[in-house]
């Protein structure tokens, strides 16, 4: 005997109480595939979530995080508090980046400044809590006789004060 449920399209469920008739999903529920025997409850985007896409009879609601938070995980399963640039989120809240590290976003961790000398370059612009250092030409390129119309200011490693 053919299973009549396989004929039920998305947005409906196969109602065993009514001789396998295809019934529309009740309000606040959906079925995204055909042949379903039940409809799934729609996700509620409340509290720390806000609605990005409303639930329909064939697809679940999609949530975003409210202002001051950002999504984590598949389908925005969690919301994590934003921090300011120059900070990272710890177990005790937002903390400033330690010296020698930076974060240019509202999320994520503080990362070490680029070590320009590893690439044979010098520091053109010092790093800050919010910005990485900018590496410039190698020290050899700045020696007397090097062809440069306007030689850049003396380079310094990050955090070193001028002599």
């Amino acid at each position: 005997l053919q299973d009549l449920c396989s004929n039920c399209p998305a947005g409906t469920f196969c109602d065993n109480n009514r001789s396998q008739i295809c019934s529309p999903c009740p309000p606040n529920s959906f079925s995204s595939a055909g042949g379903q025997r039940t409809c799934d409850i729609c996700r509620q985007c409340k509290g720390v979530f806000k609605t990005r896409k409303e639930c329909s009879s064939t697809s679940n609601a999609e949530c975003d995080c409210i202002s001051g938070y950002h999504c984590l995980g598949a389908e925005c399963s969690m919301c994590e508090q934003d921090c300011k640039q120059g900070q990272e989120l710890t177990k005790k809240g937002c903390k400033d980046c330690c010296f020698g590290t930076f974060n240019d976003q509202k999320r994520g961790i503080c990362r070490p400044w680029t070590n320009c000398s590893l690439d044979g370059k010098s520091v053109l612009v010092n790093g800050t809590k919010e910005r990485d250092v900018v590496c410039g030409p190698s020290p050899a390129d700045l020696s007397p006789g090097a062809s440069s119309a306007t030689p850049p200011a003396p380079a310094r490693e990050p955090g070193h004060s001028p002599q």
Epitope: K46, G47, V48, F49, L72, S77, M78, C79, E80, Q81, L89, K91, G93
Partner: nanobody, 117 residues
């Protein structure tokens, strides 16, 4: 699917008490820190209190310290918030959340608490 269902809200006079409950399902409740947050009319989300997975570590917002008590029953997969000496400024929709004050997920409709004479 993670489900959190809040209940226990209502209308209460200043100085009164309410006990909120949050029934959890769809995840291993005893593995997670749980949190209460609230949203007053026209305001942003405010963290209220958090409790560690085993219940040994508890923290409160200054605004509710000494008046509210968070607790949990891992055998019943339920989170509680006992609210005493309620004030008009406690009027809000209260949500329970899986996670900490900094990283959380809410899925219930919330429960309305109104403090008014």
């Amino acid at each position: 699917q993670v489900q959190l269902q809040e209940s226990g809200g209502g209308l209460v006079q200043p100085g009164g008490s309410l006990r909120l409950s949050c029934a959890a399902s769809g995840f291993t409740f005893s593995d997670h820190t749980m949190t209460w947050v609230r949203q007053a009319p026209g305001k942003g989300l405010e963290w209220v209190s958090s409790i560690s997975s085993g219940g040994s570590r508890i923290i409160y917002a200054d605004s509710v310290k000494g008046r509210f008590t968070i607790s949990r029953d891992n055998a019943k997969n339920t989170l509680y918030l006992q609210m005493n000496n309620l004030r008009p400024e406690d009027t809000a929709v209260y949500f329970c959340a899986r996670g900490t004050r900094y990283k959380m997920s809410t899925s219930g409709p919330g429960t309305q608490v109104t403090v008014s004479s």
